[in-house]
Interface confidence: low
């Protein structure tokens, strides 16, 4: 995966929250849920009230990148999805407010959001070859592809 220094000269400025309180379901129709205060996992739910609700904030790149760069926050909290390394769980990082500017190693808070039909992919800005992924009997993690599941459906207005 790409080292942090590769992107260290790119600055990302917060624009606005573009989605509120949505749910992420993977290709097996499993919803992302809180495993504990640090990690996320995926489970098939009867009741979507148990699923994590996310907010998505958009950032503008100083590189004028065509990709949509986003931050993922658990709704109504100060917890932000943070990438680690390949096959490592994504972490929930607590911050007092949404970062106004992100650069260097802090890009592990950012993801490129790509859509293909109803499929949504979140590629780590810090590790551009790795995606947010679900994996059987494991936390939500960063992965390059199968056997991990990297495509998600966004469910909105589930309240």
């Amino acid at each position: 995966s790409a080292p942090f220094s590769f992107l260290s000269n790119v600055k990302y400025n917060f624009m606005r929250i573009i989605k509120y309180e949505f749910i992420l379901n993977d290709a097996l129709n499993q919803s992302i849920i809180r495993a504990n205060d640090q990690y996320l996992t995926a489970a098939a739910l009867h009741n979507l009230d148990e699923a994590v609700k996310f907010d998505m904030g958009a950032y503008k790149s100083s590189k004028d990148d065509a990709k949509i760069t986003v931050i993922l926050r658990i709704s109504k909290t100060q917890l932000y999805v943070t990438a680690q390394d390949e096959d490592q769980p994504v972490l929930l990082k607590e911050m007092p407010e949404i970062p106004k500017t992100i650069t260097g190693s802090e890009t592990n808070l950012l993801f490129f959001w790509e859509t293909h039909g109803t499929k949504n992919y979140f590629t780590s800005v810090a590790h551009p070859n790795l995606f947010i992924a679900t994996k059987q009997d494991y936390w939500v993690c960063l992965a390059g592809g199968p056997p991990s599941i990297t495509d998600f459906q966004i469910l909105e207005n589930q309240a």
């Epitope: 809180r34 205060d37 658990i74 909290t77 309240a159």
Partner: antibody, heavy 118, light 107 residues
Amino acid sequence: EVQLQQSGAELVKPGASVKLSCTASGLNIKDTYMHWLKQRPEQGLEWIGRIDPANGNAKYDPRFLGKATITADTSSNTAYLQLSSLTSEDTAVYYCARGDGNFHFDYWGQGTTLTVSS
Amino acid sequence: DIVMTQSQRFMSTSVGDRVSVTCKASQNVGTNIAWYQQKPGQSPRALIYSASYRYSGVPDRFTGSGSGTDFTLTISNVQSVDLAEYFCQQYTRYPLTFGGGTKLEIK
């Protein structure tokens, strides 16, 4: 410092309705969820429901559907609980509480005692 | 609904002792459990969330443990100020439900 200030004790007659209030300071209720809970002597705590003040969406324990209505006024930073067709079973202390994204309650109001008696 | 059972309605202990309050869920709730303390005439106070995380300001003599269906709140070096009722609560599924409470008496 976060504080939830509830309205004062109420003595009402059976069949009547009552509206309890919970005014928050130190937090914007639009940024959180507000819950209402019921406590009767020696009966533990019962969750009535919650509201997302940002959009007015409320959820209830099915047992309180038709009995309780939760609303919020973001301009006054206040959540409300209206109880209708009151009976002696509604005599209790009612608490408002702030729920985080996981629905445990980190801040509680001081409670409002409701007495239903003729 | 998920039923939360606190089998001991009353527990008696002495200052300096260690006491464990238990709570059982009728189905798997992971670690989505909170514990509250309610002193006589007061509102409940949050002690523990996510089964084992203490709220800020809560003394470290309060410890939460467990996952799945069985949970424990342990109070070590019990103090007279711990005279209170203790409730568990699950937040895995609606409706949110509480245990019936355990009253801690100080000998």
